[in-house]
Interface confidence: medium
């Protein structure tokens, strides 16, 4: 008789999840000399240990501590780029501006980017059929707790001027319920971080409004100011030009506002 399996609302573990994590780890440590010492098999074992045989709605940050320890990495604390709802552009930016880092440019972020995973209570199986959805099932699921943990640590490490890329096409440009709004904003350290600079990315050619005046941006400014961190905001009217000008700042079209 087939054993009853919990049916969750979210998609199941990404196929070939163990192989993907291991392969990404090997690739990352080959590309980044400062992480060459990392033993990828140990990383996978620690990753697996965080969720295997555990109820996928009872995962804690403590479950991920062995993985966090193995993935400890020093990035320049004044070169951190946070993002909310605009991951693709943030990643294109750091591909060009190589001295800046998103969370997904770190080992742990790179390992888990775009992947889903969960296990089952009291079995060593990975659940490829379904995993808990953050809204419909539970928030303390393996994926959500992982990103909350690494995001908190990433924000805590930041210093000087921290940049955040926000999607100006969204109805809530700053969303208090996003990872940035609920975790990263509250874990920037006022004694280390001087300024949070928001880059609001415009979604279309006609949009010449000053989105830095948006009520949700004002809300972000208020939250940041209360934490004794300065706030500044820039409109990025033409993201394509923005990327181009990062690549080739001497271009004739890069003198005007982008």
């Amino acid at each position: 008789v087939p054993r009853w399996r919990q049916q969750w609302s979210g998609p199941g573990t990404t196929k070939r999840f163990p192989e993907t994590v291991l392969a990404r780890c090997v690739k990352y440590t080959e590309i980044h000399p400062e992480m060459r010492h990392v033993d990828c098999q140990s990383v996978w074992d620690a990753f697996k240990g965080a969720f295997i045989s555990k109820h996928p709605c009872n995962i804690t940050e403590e479950d991920y501590q062995p993985l966090m320890k193995l993935g400890t990495q020093t990035v320049p604390c004044n070169k951190i780029l946070l993002w909310s709802r605009i991951k693709d552009l943030a990643h294109q930016f750091t591909q060009v501006q190589r001295d800046m880092f998103t969370l997904e440019d770190t080992l742990l972020g790179y390992l888990a980017d775009d992947l889903t995973w969960c296990g089952e209570f009291n079995t060593s199986k990975i659940n490829y059929q379904s995993c808990p959805d953050w809204r419909k099932d539970c928030s303390n699921n393996p994926v959500s707790v992982f990103w909350k943990t690494v995001s908190r640590r990433f924000a805590e490490a930041a210093c000087d001027v921290v940049h955040v890329m926000l999607n100006g096409s969204r109805s809530k440009i700053f969303d208090k319920n996003s990872t940035f709004g609920s975790v990263e904003v509250h874990n920037l350290q006022p004694e280390k971080v001087q300024t949070l600079e928001a880059w609001v990315i415009h979604g279309g050619r006609e949009d010449s409004r000053d989105l830095c005046q948006d009520p949700t941006i004002k809300e972000l400014e208020s939250i940041i100011s209360k934490r004794n961190i300065q706030f500044s905001c820039k409109n990025i009217y033409r993201p394509d030009k923005f990327l181009q000008c990062v690549k080739n700042p001497e271009d004739s079209s890069c003198t005007s506002e982008i």
Epitope: D88, G203, G204, R205, E206, D207, P239, D240, L243, D251
Partner: antibody
Framework: EVQLLESGGGLVQPGGSLRLSCAAF????????MNWVRQAPGKGLEWVSS????????GYADSVKGRFTISRDNSKNTLYLQMNNLRAEDTAVYYC???????????WGQGTTVTVSS | QSVLTQPPSASGTPGQRVTISCSGS????????VNWYQQLPGTAPKLLIY??QRPSGVPDRFSGSKSGTSASLAISGLQSEDEADYYC???????????FGGGTKLTVL
């Protein structure tokens, strides 16, 4: 599944009109600038027109300016191209494609054929 | 006459590396990002390279680069399924229009 489906093509006489439609599925239509690109038989790709996310900005190739009008209905997830005063040289497969200003035209429809002939 | 200039044809044998060039001006290629599209026979174009990056699902055999007013698409480890038409495209600030290259027909011998 992310896809764009064009319709409205057909055979029309010179000087006639056609209205092309492009229905969007599987992505947030209102987040994307939209485009029409055409390809005459045996020829390369030619941009026809673009429209911004809210529809307040439109752009046209010189070859269709004053004859073609691009529009969109974000509530219906649909893009349109009204083509008036059609000429033989407008004969082509017409594709709609979405566009994000930092990611190119990444989703294309299958195309709809417009033939202008007497 | 296309605003962006591409060679009409290119060819190579399986496993070879082939490069397709795209020449423009400061108002298009130099000042803007370049896209490359692949059009397999009888199908719609497909985004192949954007901002020298590959969308997910595009093999890493394809790469794009740009220098000044020229861009190029490189295909390494050529395969028979790469036989297609390839187009470069960029926004042109002067024309306020998208401009495409005339297309390059790639033949795998």
């Amino acid at each position: 599944e992310v896809q764009l489906l064009e319709s409205g093509g057909g055979l029309v006489q010179p000087g006639g009109s056609l209205r092309l439609s492009c229905a969007a599925f599987g992505f947030t239509f209102s987040d994307y600038e939209m485009n029409w690109v055409r390809q005459a038989p045996g020829k390369g790709l030619e941009w026809v027109s673009s429209i911004s996310i809210t529809g307040s900005w439109t752009g046209y190739a010189d070859s269709v300016k004053g004859r073609f009008t691009i529009s969109r209905d974000n509530s219906k997830n649909t893009l349109y191209l009204q083509m008036n005063n059609l000429r033989a040289e407008d004969t082509a497969v017409y594709y709609c494609a979405n566009y994000k200003s930092y990611y190119g035209m990444d989703v294309w429809g299958q195309g709809t054929t417009v033939t202008v002939s007497s | 006459q296309s605003v962006l200039t591409q060679p009409p044809s290119a060819s190579g044998t399986p496993g070879q590396r082939v490069t397709i060039s795209c020449s423009g001006s400061s108002s298009n290629i130099r000042n803007n990002l370049v896209n490359w599209y692949q059009q397999l026979p009888g199908t719609a174009p497909k985004l192949l390279i954007y901002n020298a990056q590959r969308p997910s699902g595009v093999p890493d055999r394809f790469s794009g680069s740009k220098s000044g007013t020229s861009a190029s698409l490189a295909i390494s480890g050529l395969q028979s399924e790469d036989e297609a038409d390839y187009y470069c495209a960029a926004w042109d600030d002067s024309l306020n229009a998208w401009v495409f290259g005339g297309g390059t027909k790639l033949t795998v011998l």
